[in-house]
């Protein structure tokens, strides 16, 4: 059987000679050099070589466990005379024994962290990491202990596991904000002769809130003149903040003073100035100076610096405001007055009235700009604004008279004002219904009493509150032995219906109806149309086969029945079947 | 179906003031013009007062002018007739009507009678 | 004031034929058309005729209509006891924008 032991070498040997591993042999050996000892596997021949009559193994090469740390080979004894193993192969392990020849390496160059200022001490602030490539298992040399060389007293290190933390109260980033800490990892359990490795670790400070806005003046003062319409900016206040970002961002408001319902203040955002604004019109003439008190806070606080007080401050604003001479003011911005169409000439319609806003109340005149009424139906009384129609009036021409009223002091015509005026025409039934279009129908010679053949419709340029209702008849002077009847249809439409049975158009060709359309308002208007009606010879299908010519010129042809339209190319047969006319042969 | 119905008559002294009012029903009230028409006991009928669609235009009788005011609330189908000023000869029953058919008056109140005694 | 004339009163047989007159002027029957009211007694008028001639549905052809210059006439055919009340004619005024109504003519059922 063999005889050997687990084999152990030693790394990095800087020996002259070879570097002797040990020996493999067999008890079957009797020394006489008749056994021969042959290596194979891991670096056999190479890393590995056997005296293959004694058995002594040597290596040749340096080696490096943190290479290969173990090398497996396999053993054969042989019997030289007869070449056959006089023991089985076997399989045996060189193991490379560590030495401490690496130091530990950070997992990065340089480390960046942050952590908020103002921290409590201890504060987790970033892990840094070395890893050292020594045998972990065999001694200290891969033991990496952490320490602070540079950082102090900022900063503190645990020495197990590289946890950087902060070490000092108030560290404050108004006073410093970058910090270059340099940690060291060193093996050996940190002891002498220990190699080591260093990191940077760059450490910023964040803000917090901890510091107020201040003005940096308890009082400003601006100037505005009193026309300054409403959004227009009079000012710029800006309170400091030692924080950034939204630590920084400052709200303003004004919490107190005599203006606070005539001033606006507004952040700008970009800069993080107060800007004063004009809320209300101002006047001059009832109020010169407003002294407002303006706030600038915080909107982002942090409960636990409220102890170091207040997060806002004050300031006094003072606003002089600056005399203007103004133009006359209405009393409203624009009037809105209604009159009947039917008003006579000289109509008072309504009245307008302006005054100088100023001290000195300097009279006005009125007048109306021409350009608006270029028809002059309106005029004014430039005295006392009393607006009176010129000129009659129709709503049914035009329904809003838009004007134009200017107010011009007396004593200094530049100063004008301008006021619109939309006046309402109201409707009067003052227009008669009449036909909606021209009729012209026709009646076959062989037509059938109470036979419908036109439906009339009529318009009315009035406009009623609900719409029109209309009235038809056949005139009076018409309506006695008429050979037609209107049927009033209740619904705005009225029917013609034959009155007997058959027609001769050689004894009368054409039938001129007189209708009386009436509307059902007040006053009553009424009006008189005519209706053409046609007598045609047709053939049993109610298809026309003679008539005058007349009867054929209007382009829109004939039509009969619900007020349809056809085309003056539409066979009449079409148009007595699509009514359902019944006829007699 | 359309229906008038007036309210508001009663005994009133000389010089005295009464309300009518007329609800109208069943028909688009504020397409037509109404009118109020009145018959003193014994009497044929007098027409009294005109007012149109809108309430833009009204008229009186000679009898009341002045004293008597037609006005109408279209938002409440409903027609009015202000009497001040009353009179002996002003006792009658007074009907709203609905003029229509070129002025015909289709449609009757069932009348409500005023009295003008001391 | 009454502007329209019309006889006080008819009468007539039943089965009778009677007439009704109504006398106007130029500004109310001469331009405008005629209507006519049937009251029975205790009741509101009822319109009768309108359009001078026309009868609303309801009514029978009975009563008829008709207009001439400035007068008016209202004929019943057939009379009838149910027929016995006042009738009244009436027309818009085209001069003054009012309505006029005559005094009414009551009319009489015999037997």
């Known amino acids: 059987s063999w005889m050997w032991n687990q084999f152990f070498l030693l790394e990095e040997y800087t020996g002259s000679d070879y570097q002797y591993v040990g020996k493999l042999h067999s008890d079957q050996d009797r020394g006489d050099g008749s056994l021969k000892y042959i290596l194979s596997g891991d670096g056999a021949g190479d890393l590995f070589i056997i005296n293959e009559n004694t058995g002594d193994i040597q290596a040749t090469k340096r080696l490096d466990r943190e290479e290969k740390p173990v090398y497996i080979l396999r053993a054969q004894a042989i019997n030289r005379r007869t070449g056959r193993p006089v023991e089985p192969e076997s399989e045996f392990i060189i193991k490379i024994h560590d030495i401490n020849d690496n130091e530990p390496i950070f997992t990065k160059d340089v480390y960046t962290a942050t952590v908020p200022e103002m921290a409590d001490v201890g504060t987790f602030v970033v892990q840094v990491t070395a890893t050292d490539a020594d045998d972990p298992t065999y001694g200290n040399s891969a033991k990496v202990v952490y320490s602070i060389l540079q950082g102090q007293p900022y900063f503190s290190v645990e020495s197990e596991t590289g946890i950087i933390k902060t070490a000092l109260l108030n560290m404050d980033r108004e006073n410093r904000e970058q910090y270059q800490v340099v940690i060291q990892a060193k093996d050996m359990g940190g002891q002498m002769g220990g190699l080591s490795g260093t990191t940077t670790v760059n450490i910023t400070l964040t803000d917090v809130n901890d510091n107020p806005p201040r003005f940096p003046q308890s009082t400003y003062q601006f100037k505005t003149p009193e026309s300054s319409p409403p959004g227009t900016p009079i000012g710029r206040i800006k309170a400091s903040d030692a924080d950034v970002g939204e630590n920084a961002e400052i709200e303003y408001s004004i919490t107190d003073g005599e203006g606070h319902d005539m001033f606006d203040v507004i952040t700008d955002q970009e800069t993080q100035e107060g800007i004063i604004t004009v809320k209300k019109l101002l006047d001059f003439e009832k109020k010169r100076v407003y002294t407002l008190k303006v706030e600038a806070s915080n909107p982002h606080i942090e409960p636990r610096f409220l102890y170091l007080g207040p997060f806002k401050d004050s300031a006094t604003v003072r606003i002089v405001v600056d005399d203007v001479d103004e133009p006359p003011v209405f009393s409203k911005l624009a009037y809105i007055l209604q009159i009947r169409e039917d008003a006579q000439i000289n109509t008072t319609i309504g009245s307008v009235a302006a005054q100088d806003p100023d001290a000195a109340r300097n009279p006005v005149k009125y007048s109306v700009d021409r350009h608006t009424d270029m028809d002059r139906i309106f005029n004014i009384d430039s005295g006392n604004g009393s607006i009176f129609t010129s000129k009659l009036l129709d709503r049914e021409t035009l329904l809003w008279h838009n004007i134009t009223v200017i107010a011009t002091e007396i004593n200094n015509p530049k100063q004008s004002s301008r006021v619109p005026l939309y006046i309402k025409v109201l409707d009067v039934n003052d227009n008669a219904p009449e036909f909606a279009e021209f009729y012209e129908t026709f009646v076959c010679e062989k037509a059938k009493a109470d036979q419908l053949i036109q439906t009339l419709h009529a318009v009315d340029k009035d406009d009623p509150y609900s719409g029109h209702q209309f009235s038809f008849s056949l005139a009076p002077e018409a309506a006695s032995g008429s050979n037609f009847t209107i049927q009033d249809n209740k619904d705005n439409t009225a029917g013609i219906l034959t009155r007997k049975n058959g027609y001769n158009r050689h004894e009368m060709s054409t039938y001129l109806l007189p209708v009386v359309i009436s509307d059902n308002d007040y006053p009553v208007q009424s009006s008189t149309g005519t209706v053409t009606v046609r007598v045609c010879a047709c053939d049993h299908h109610g298809n026309m086969q003679s008539c005058h010519a007349e009867a054929l010129i209007h382009p829109t042809g004939l039509s009969t029945g619900a007020g349809s339209e056809f085309r003056h190319d539409s066979g009449l047969n079409d148009i007595f079947e699509a009514q359902k006319i019944e006829w007699h042969e | 179906q359309v229906q008038l119905l007036e309210s508001g008559g009663g005994l009133v002294q000389p010089g005295g003031s009464l309300r009518l009012s007329c609800a109208a029903s069943?028909?688009?009230?504020?397409?037509?013009?109404m009118n109020w028409v009145r018959q003193a006991p014994g009497k044929g009928l007098e027409w009294v007062s005109v007012i149109s669609s809108s309430g833009s235009n009204t008229n009186y009788a000679d009898s009341v002018k002045g004293r008597f005011t037609i006005s109408r609330d279209n938002s409440k189908n409903t027609l009015y007739l202000q009497m001040n000023s009353l009179r002996a000869e002003d006792t009658a029953v007074y009907y709203c009507?609905?003029?229509?058919?070129?002025?015909?008056?289709?449609?009757w109140g069932q009348g409500t009678l005023v009295t003008v005694s001391s | 004031d009454i502007v329209l004339t019309q006889p006080p009163s008819v009468s007539g047989a039943p089965g009778q034929r009677v007439t009704i007159s109504c006398s106007g002027s130029?500004?109310?029957?001469?331009?405008?058309?005629v209507s006519w009211y049937q009251q029975l007694p205790g009741t509101a008028p009822k319109l009768l005729i309108y359009d001078n001639s026309n009868r609303p549905s309801g009514v029978p052809d009975r009563f008829s209509g008709s207009k001439s210059g400035t007068s008016a006439s209202l004929a019943i055919t057939g009379l009838q006891a149910e027929d016995e009340a006042d009738y009244y004619c009436?027309?818009?005024?085209?001069?003054?924008?009012?309505?006029?109504f005559g005094g009414g003519t009551k009319l009489t059922v015999l037997g």
């Open positions: 009436s027309s818009y005024d085209s001069f003054d924008h009012s309505w006029v």
């Open positions: 069943g028909f688009t009230f504020s397409s037509f013009a």
């Open positions: 130029s500004s109310n029957i001469g331009s405008n058309f």
């Open positions: 009507a609905r003029p229509s058919y070129f002025q015909a008056m289709d449609y």
